[in-house]
Amino acid sequence: GIAIPRNSGCPNSEDKNFPRTVMVNLNIHNRNTSTNPKRSSDYYNRSTSPWNLHRNEDPERYPSVIWEAKCRHLGCVKADGNVDYHMNSVPIQQEILVLRREPRHCPNSFRLEKILVSVGCTCVTPIVHHVA
Amino acid sequence: GIAIPRNSGCPNSEDKNFPRTVMVNLNIHNRNTSTNPKRSSDYYNRSTSPWNLHRNEDPERYPSVIWEAKCRHLGCVKADGNVDYHMNSVPIQQEILVLRREPRHCPNSFRLEKILVSVGCTCVTPIVHHVA
């Protein structure tokens, strides 16, 4: 857990909710070098394991909108454009942090939440289970 | 910007820093159904665009450890195990939220930060630029 601070110059934490509750400055600092990176660009179309992006919207969460990748095929796309079912398109998932409004309707009170999102797809060799 | 709330039952926001500052409960709620999902499992090894995971650690950030994917090859791995340089292994990137301690070393004061992380790799057809 997060320990109780005694640092001078830090915001007061003598709150009954501390150490569970912290102050967060919402002036987001963006560490991305490009101001608007085309992150995964058009990879979703050019990949051998292409995917579609589906919008997941929830106004009680920040970010309110998250895009979920759904692989287009069970198999992977070959150079001739056909699908090779000897290979598998699988989603690459990542656990991300979001802020959930809590109590609901309170615009300045949140709870940290972890959610699992599919970011894109990759083509893998299947695991073959041999029957004895 | 974010406006000053007057909702009863909501945390007080008559702070000189408000509306930039909100309260966040750090008792993380985990929405993932599985308690410990093997997120992208062993896909990093089985993928035709395999990757290695590099640890990015920063004690002034939450989460303090983030795993960054680095594609192993410029090309993609063929069925015979050789690398096909007519295809490209590329990182799938995602913008994620982290909490940055601010002022530094203050355990209960954070700033929201967006960082771009590589989650895994996918195999794409290269964009060929034809010279006239």
């Epitope: 608007n36 919008r55 919207e57 920040y62 309110s64 909108v65 309707h105 | -």
Partner: antibody, heavy 122, light 110 residues
Framework: EVQLVESGGGLVKPEGSLRLSCAAS?????????MCWVRQAPGKGLEWIAC?????????DYASWARGRFTISRDNSKNTVYLQMNSLRAEDTAVYYC?????????????WGQGTLVTVSS | DIQMTQSPSSLSASVGDRVTITCQAS??????LAWYQQKPGKPPKLLIY???TLASGVPSRFSGSGSGTDFTLTISSLQPEDFATYYC????????????FGGGTKLTVL
Amino acid sequence: EVQLVESGGGLVKPEGSLRLSCAASGFSFSSDYWMCWVRQAPGKGLEWIACIYAGDVDDTDYASWARGRFTISRDNSKNTVYLQMNSLRAEDTAVYYCARVDGFDITYFDLWGQGTLVTVSS
Amino acid sequence: DIQMTQSPSSLSASVGDRVTITCQASQTINYWLAWYQQKPGKPPKLLIYRASTLASGVPSRFSGSGSGTDFTLTISSLQPEDFATYYCQNYYYSTSRSYGFGGGTKLTVL
């Protein structure tokens, strides 16, 4: 100063086309915002037209009546959002406002331009 | 689409009066409702969001309440600068997002 400035309005004949522009300054188009168009006919109320995500995913929403005739687009390098209007009718005469939705709270419009007047008349 | 019915459509009052404007949604919108003030020749100005949260810089004489389908904007003591047209606005998401506005309430001097 954070502001939105619309341009491109004017007189157009019925069945004609027009492209409106909205230049943003004081902030950059990014994953933090959605850019929208809202219109107001003379002496009438406000009517939402469409919104577009300002981040790196191409995503749009349209009012049911606007889909097909109106197209929202953006150019992040120019920090500008556009509204292409086709097959214009007299009832499309209105002040067209550019408005921003902050991704922190997508339930309302937090910034508005001054508007540009479009008149559809023969 | 969700219909937003605002009433009254026009209202006359005097400085110092307490004024109430209502907005009714055709289906539940939780508390995702905003109120705007608009003066002639100007764009709308945000007053209230999330049904009851006062926007930055807005005087405390303005307040909002309600949830579900019924919402109210109250001006506790009218000031000369408050004579304007007021609009409610909803947010809704099902398969796609939509915003809708009420027809407006024109507040004039009695």
